[in-house]
Amino acid sequence: SQVSQNCHNGSYEISVLMMGNSAFAEPLKNLEDAVNEGLEIVRGRLQNAGLNVTVNATFMYSDGLIHNSGDCRSSTCEGLDLLRKISNAQRMGCVLIGPSCTYSTFQMYLDTELSYPMISAGSFGLSCDYKETLTRLMSPARKLMYFLVNFWKTNDLPFKTYSWSTSYVYKNGTETEDCFWYLNALEASVSYFSHELGFKVVLRQDKEFQDILMDHNRKSNVIIMCGGPEFLYKLKGDRAVAEDIVIILVDLFNDQYFEDNVTAPDYMKNVLVLTLSPGNSLLNSSFSRNLSPTKRDFALAYLNGILLFGHMLKIFLENGENITTPKFAHAFRNLTFEGYDGPVTLDDWGDVDSTMVLLYTSVDTKKYKVLLTYDTHVNKTYPVDMSPTFTWKNSKLPNDITGRGPQ
């Protein structure tokens, strides 16, 4: 049903869903702080533009009585319950910043007539792709998939002279929300990744993964998994690994690789880490000081959500356009705005673009070094280290199938 919006006469409200079930176990207080910091910046920017308006946020809390698992498993109805609460209270703002869980976002989008924009820090799954009024400020699974296909096909770099067409995917069901949907996308038989690969098998048991490491009859040398070094070590332990195995460790929202004095443990030598390029000032900013390295991106997405709203509000007000229109609801895409830590670009479907970074462990220095970067906006790979000090033979990535010659 249509809900009246508190979004006119110089007063503009943002509805922030504070859900018990969240993509990351971040205290709601930290998210509130991020939103409030964003509001301060937006007010300053609007004032500088000569726009004398009020912008506030209303935090809508779930009662947590029914949906209390804390993770995303019971989030499907929580989002709808919160929307109902907003509807009953007639407290809808100009924009909804909220559900981070794919289940809740998908259900809310499906079950409501959204005439307002929805901004999500999360909603990683393919089921949230191509939604007309949804904006996602953390890299969704589709972006990861496009990188992997691009990298698999690459065969003209000094360190990668073979195209790959095979892969194992390790997915045991205990993943974090982001990893769950990333691996889900790789597993899906109808996905772009599956379509482009000739062979792909999902390993669901620890033993399956462990056996592949030294199995002479393995069908691929490449294993994709998602998590941090600790997660890999828990699984792999001190087991020997065949020399032509390549583990791709997807760990997008972890800035630790770029911190001072970090050294890679021995077990990371066969591993390429895929992560996001860290923000210029974020590692030392006051905003992120109290956040763990894996939570910075989540709180930052909330903050950037506020800044995105401020950006759109400014444009529409300067053009004398109405905020409570489908045009406004559909406008949060195909643009670049000034985020907390520099420009943020959204693609045609409202999904954030970013620079992904592939790291390797230098056998000389035991440091993580950048092998290449990938711009999700243009779907292009840029080599960085042309002569990496790899563990692999001849300092080149091996073929994905043992014993197969040049392609």
């Epitope: 070094p229 600790e230 332990g237 630790q256 004095n261 970090v262 050294t263």
Partner: nanobody
Framework: EVRLVESGGGLVQPGGSLRLSCAVS????????VDWYHQAPGKQRELVAG???????SYADAVKGRFTISTDNVKDTVYLQMNSLTPEDTAVYYC?????????WGQGTQVTVSS
């Protein structure tokens, strides 16, 4: 941050034994590895023995059969039992840990083997 405190060093006669302790400020199974290194005067620091939370132990050739690395999971302490000591074992012994991200070092404990 991982803090390491070594103890148990001292003066011992050739053929004698000592047990060094390294108290770790974190649960030892939450970190990757704990090692013992030694540094003799005017020489480089060398790995003596290592333990990983995956359950592996390793030893330098010179100490195999004489030194044993072990852990107390309750006290989060790693021990180095040193038997059949020789004057060549005289050195400062350092505890080292890697928590999957960074290297940490203790202050060291002096071991002197002399008659």
């Amino acid at each position: 941050e991982v803090r390491l405190v070594e103890s148990g060093g001292g003066l011992v006669q050739p053929g004698g034994s000592l047990r060094l302790s390294c108290a770790v400020s974190k649960n030892i199974f939450s970190i990757y590895r704990v090692d013992w290194y030694h540094q003799a005067p005017g020489k480089q620091r060398e790995l003596v023995a290592g333990w990983t939370s995956g359950g592996s132990t390793s030893y330098a050739d010179a100490v195999k059969g004489r030194f044993t690395i072990s852990t107390d999971n309750v006290k989060d302490t790693v021990y180095l039992q040193m038997n059949s000591l020789t004057p060549e074992d005289t050195a400062v012994y350092y505890c080292h840990a890697h928590d999957h991200w960074r290297d940490y070092w203790g202050q060291g404990t002096q071991v002197t083997v002399s008659s």
